[in-house]
């Protein structure tokens, strides 16, 4: 039975040219993290594998980095990088546990941070 | 449609060396944990090598170790096998594998195989 | 010898649930997944069954995985004449940080 809970950052806002943390945390399980992958819509930026170590997407080589953690940091931030973004923890024995963000990236300087929420 | 194309194998004397390789289309190679698998005439299969999104991590079964090196090139959507120091007991068809986007899912998608005979 | 175990061999005749076992240890199919393959005689094996108990799309709902333990079955009913072949598991091993492969089960259909 899948027990476990995803924190995430929530919604949040960034000014465009600035750099976000995407953060999700796993709670209420002792289940085993094998691996967590990082996705925009369908695409994949990154993956962080317990045995392996981090990968970051080709295509977002320039633009991501790993961590802090299990987390992931967006740089140089542009308007179509507005959007959902996924944490997809994939853990033994549970399954899959999925966690959302929305970014909305801002012209101005009216960037602020939203409320964290919770996705059981 | 997912491809591994193995080319390379052929006979060789104790002692010698041959590259294999691994030619791969229909899918974004570099997002992907790839391995190395062999058969030896009538036996079961042996996994031989595996390496990581960008090669910065391989591991190897005992049996290869310090002889036996993997890599990939991602630009060339391409991975090898180099062996060296080759022994009787390395006569198999040697089998190049994609791995699931969780690695430790196993592998999904194989080649047709190459053969490796040592013999003098 | 390999580090997960299998019957070398099982039979069954057309129609007929045949199950194949695979045994391991805490540090493989305990605290892992399991992969089953099917290779046909001259050919590459091909992927039946991934994360234990799942079913690639194209694979018919005939063949099924499970776990229990340190041991892991596969399950294939209905059995027909084109499902002669050898089967393996497989596991990923967290203390060798290798992939384990059972030694094989050659099936016959009667």
């Known amino acids: 039975m899948m027990t476990g809970t995803i924190e995430t950052t929530g919604n949040i806002s960034a000014e465009k040219g600035g750099s976000i943390i995407l953060q999700c945390h796993l709670s209420s399980t002792t289940a085993q993290v094998t691996q967590v992958n990082w996705e925009q819509q369908d695409q994949l930026l990154a993956i962080c594998n317990a045995d392996l170590g981090w990968h970051i997407s080709p295509s977002f080589k320039d633009r991501v980095a790993p961590g802090p953690g299990l987390g992931l940091t967006l740089q140089s931030l542009t308007v179509n990088d507005t959007g959902e973004y996924f944490c997809i923890y994939h853990t033994y024995p549970d399954g899959t546990y999925t966690g959302r963000i929305f970014l909305e990236v801002l012209e101005s300087s009216v960037a602020e941070h939203g409320a964290r929420f919770q996705i059981p | 449609e997912v491809q591994l194309l193995e080319s390379g194998g052929g006979l060789v004397q104790p002692g010698g060396s041959l590259r294999l390789s691994c030619a791969a289309s229909?899918?974004?190679?570099?997002?992907?944990?790839m391995s190395w698998v062999r058969q030896a005439p009538g036996k079961g299969l042996e996994w031989v090598s595996l390496i990581n999104w960008n090669g910065d991590k391989t591991y190897y079964a005992d049996s290869v170790k310090g002889r036996f090196t993997i890599s990939r090139d991602n630009s060339k959507n391409t991975l090898y096998l180099q062996m060296n120091s080759l022994r009787a007991e390395d006569t198999a068809i040697y089998y190049c594998?994609?791995?699931?986007?969780?690695?430790?899912?196993?592998?999904?998608?194989w080649g047709r195989g190459t053969t490796v005979t040592v013999s003098s | 010898q390999s580090v997960l175990t299998q019957p070398p061999s099982a039979s069954g005749t057309p129609g007929q649930r045949v199950t194949i076992s695979c045994s391991g240890s805490i540090s493989n199919i305990e605290t892992k997944y399991v992969s089953w393959y099917q290779q046909l005689p001259g050919t590459a094996p091909k992927l039946l069954i991934y994360?234990?108990?799942q079913r690639p799309s194209g694979v018919p709902d005939r063949f099924s995985g499970s776990k229990s333990g340190t041991s892991a079955s596969l399950a294939i009913s209905g059995l027909q004449s084109e499902d002669e072949a050898d089967y393996y598991c497989v596991s990923w091993d967290a203390s060798l940080k290798s992939w384990v492969f059972g030694g094989g089960t050659k099936l016959t259909v009667l």
């Open positions: 229909g899918f974004t190679f570099d997002d992907y944990v």
């Open positions: 594998a994609k791995h699931w986007i969780v690695f430790q899912y196993g592998m999904d998608v």
């Open positions: 994360n234990s108990d």
